[in-house]
């Protein structure tokens, strides 16, 4: 059962796993959620009745029954991990904590103009977990405006104390705001020979890489495959670091793979979600339960629904035994990974999908693209919405994209003459416009947020957000698309599609079935040549064939230019403007979404 509220002046008794320090109960809850075993926690706030050495302690707890006895205690705040909840969660913490000094290893000290600049420095430094900044009111003259970058083994402070005129905060790497290089390569036949900070068992290099990404100290990794000559090291995932942040020595060794933490590009790839099945593979660990199940998929469901289950092994049924049901072994360990991995015993193993909600929903697999043809099929573009106006009569107005459970991203020019959000309706999960009847459910629009620098589509800033009155429940036919990460600014997208119900030629009508077209991106320089009378800015992106023939058109406005990269779809552009439709040497012009990520986050995360 999901319990989100915090219990004031309440302490959970027993079940302690470990104690960390956090600046707030809210952040303690996040730390508990991301810990492999924590289900409950007790946080101690600052209070005259409490020993100051216990202030800001966050005790992570576990319980077989998923609950613990409650005891009244002043200044204690307790609660449950979000593991039990179905809503999406994030480690992103933008809060700034006033008059708190978060202790750690101070490895870098420099002058900064503001706490924000200090936080940016931390976010752009590969080792930094959190920072403390002495403001210009700090009593000691030589320490004023000093920005201390800090790290610890756990990523959380080793202690937190009260200190006047300082502020502290965390790196925003987990908010996808780092400008650090994103290095996605996995190097075969390579061992990085730097110091190990931890080791876990993993079924493949991709899982090893994901574990490295969410491990606070891991910057790169080496994985020994199941063919590695030394038997005791097979399936071993070594989590590594170095002073420079880069591997110092690379050794060529067959059957080993190495790669990097994806912490600076984490919003465009799944990090926590290990969704594959591993055939002829047994995961060993502490046994939680043994249940009969029809298939390995059913076993994974059972594991996902059991809050303490971290991974499983399914043994298929022998011939006609047990009504064709096999045995599903639900398992756990101290770190969330198998204690050993064995091959050749016929088991099928995998991980809980409970942690998938810690990744952006937009990274989860969707239906494969249907190649050829121009009509889409249901569920092919689950982020695409149709925006209707009801005034003077109901009609399709523009396209849009689901980017969050209460947010649609679209074009600002769609709202010319729209006096009020009350006349707007957002329909999701729609393939054919003819499906929309009077009783078809829709989302009302609470607020239209148009970029304040928008004047007209051709001059840029053609971007708008719609805040919905109710939240979208994600399903196979309605789910969000990922925003491009600032760390991926330099990605060259080669698999881009424009979709919409718009005209198929300049003088036409709105289409019934959602149309799709694969369109290549065009450089801004090339695009500028085609539009001499306009200024094509870096906040615009162009797409189209030189010979024309495929393009967005009237009615597609506001809809997505969706590009697939590393198996994840990204909202690269918003259909904005162009000269005619599909004309030769006249590419379509789209709002370049990556340039507005900060604006989108600012508007959607505002309290």
């Amino acid at each position: 059962e999901c319990v989100t509220q915090l219990l004031k002046d309440t302490c959970f008794e027993g079940g302690d796993i470990t104690t960390v320090f956090t600046p707030s109960a809210k952040y303690c809850q996040v730390v508990c959620t991301y810990h492999p075993r924590c289900l409950l926690f007790t946080f101690t706030a600052e209070s005259p009745s409490e020993d100051p050495t216990r202030w800001f302690t966050c005790v992570l707890k576990d319980s077989v029954t998923e609950t613990l006895p409650r005891v009244n205690r002043t200044a204690a705040i307790s609660g449950y991990s979000f593991k039990q909840c179905s809503h999406q969660i994030s480690a992103c913490n933008k809060d700034i904590y006033v008059d708190l000094d978060m202790k750690g290893i101070n490895y870098n000290s420099s002058v900064a103009k503001s706490a924000q600049e200090c936080q940016e420095r931390c976010t752009d430094d590969v080792h930094c977990h959190f920072f403390t900044y002495a403001t210009r009111q700090f009593p000691s003259l030589e320490h004023r405006n000093i920005c201390l970058l800090k790290h610890t083994q756990t990523g959380t402070p080793t202690r937190i104390t009260k200190l006047d005129k300082v502020v502290s905060g965390f790196s925003l790497k987990s908010c996808a705001l780092s400008n650090l290089a994103c290095i996605r390569d996995i190097f075969p036949n390579t061992v990085f020979a730097d110091s190990n900070i931890d080791s876990v068992m993993a079924p493949d290099a991709f899982v090893c890489g994901r574990i490295c990404t969410h491990h606070p100290g891991c910057l790169f990794f080496t994985f020994f495959s199941q063919e590695w000559p030394k038997e005791s090291q097979r399936n071993l995932c070594l989590l590594k670091t170095s002073e420079s942040g880069l591997p110092s020595t690379r050794i060529k060794k067959s059957k080993a793979l190495s790669g990097f933490s994806l912490q600076s590009c984490r919003h465009s790839i799944p990090v926590f979600c290990h969704s594959s099945f591993y055939h002829d593979t047994d995961f060993l660990g502490e046994e939680l339960d043994i249940v009969a199940a029809k298939s390995h998929e059913a076993c994974q469901k059972l594991c996902t629904n059991a809050v303490r289950c971290q991974f499983f092994t399914y043994t298929p049924a022998q011939a006609s035994c047990n009504e064709g049901k096999g045995k599903c072994y639900l398992k756990l360990s101290s770190n969330g990974s198998p204690t050993k991995i064995l091959h050749g015993r016929g088991g099928i193993s995998g991980y809980t999908l409970r942690l998938c909600k810690m990744d952006n929903e937009c990274t989860t697999k969707i239906k494969p693209r249907i190649v050829g043809g121009t009509a889409s099929v249901r569920g092919e573009w689950p982020w695409q919405v149709t925006l209707h106006t009801t005034s003077p009569t109901q009609r399709h107005l523009c396209g849009g994209s689901i980017i969050g459970n209460q947010w649609i991203l679209t074009a600002a020019h769609c709202f010319y003459g729209v006096e009020s959000p009350k006349i707007l309706r957002v329909y999701s999960g729609i393939l054919n416009q003819s499906e929309i009847k009077e009783d078809t459910s829709f989302f009302g629009v609470q607020e239209i947020i148009i970029h304040d620098q928008y004047k007209m589509a051709e001059s840029g800033y053609d971007i708008a957000l719609l805040k919905l009155e109710t939240t979208v429940n994600y399903t196979d036919s309605q789910r969000p698309i990922c925003l491009p990460s600032k760390g991926d600014r330099n990605v060259i997208y080669t698999d881009c599609w424009v979709t919409g119900w718009g005209y198929r030629k300049l003088r036409d009508k709105i289409q019934n079935t959602l149309q799709k077209a694969k369109i290549p991106l065009v450089t801004n320089e090339e695009c500028q040549k085609r539009y001499r009378g306009h200024k094509i800015t870096h906040k615009m992106i162009c797409a189209g064939y030189r010979e024309g023939g495929k393009d967005a058109c009237k009615g597609d406005s506001g809809g997505p230019l969706s590009c697939k990269h590393n198996e994840v779809w990204h909202l690269v552009g918003i259909t904005s403007w162009g000269e005619g439709c599909a004309q030769r040497e006249r590419p379509g012009v789209y709002t370049n979404v990556v340039e507005y990520v900060d604006w989108i986050l600012e508007k959607t995360q505002a309290v």
Partner: nanobody
Amino acid sequence: QVQLVESGGGLVQPGGSLRLSCAASGYTFNNNFVGWFRQAPGKEREGVAAIYSLGGSTYYADSVKGRFTISQDNSKNTVYLQMNSLRAEDTAVYYCAGAITWVPPLSHRRYTYWGQGTLVTVSS
């Protein structure tokens, strides 16, 4: 002692091409970031392109994407910047720089070693 030496600059007409080279001694490009930066008179130094030599991951400023290509030859310990479709606004002194830590690839403040620079002038 680390030395980075740029070459290949010169005068070129708009629309033309140039290839800059950066040769290193006392510093190996392998396992490090190498960046090309430029500085026009009266302007701040800006990142143009960078490469992480181990895997060849490349990073470009928006203003040069699609026109400039950064590449490496590890055997010669040299990094190149191929510049096509040059414009007047590309006129600047181009610097090669080496980093010894994991960096924001186009942030000049985070690079440790610098060459003397080579002048590129785009003019008709």
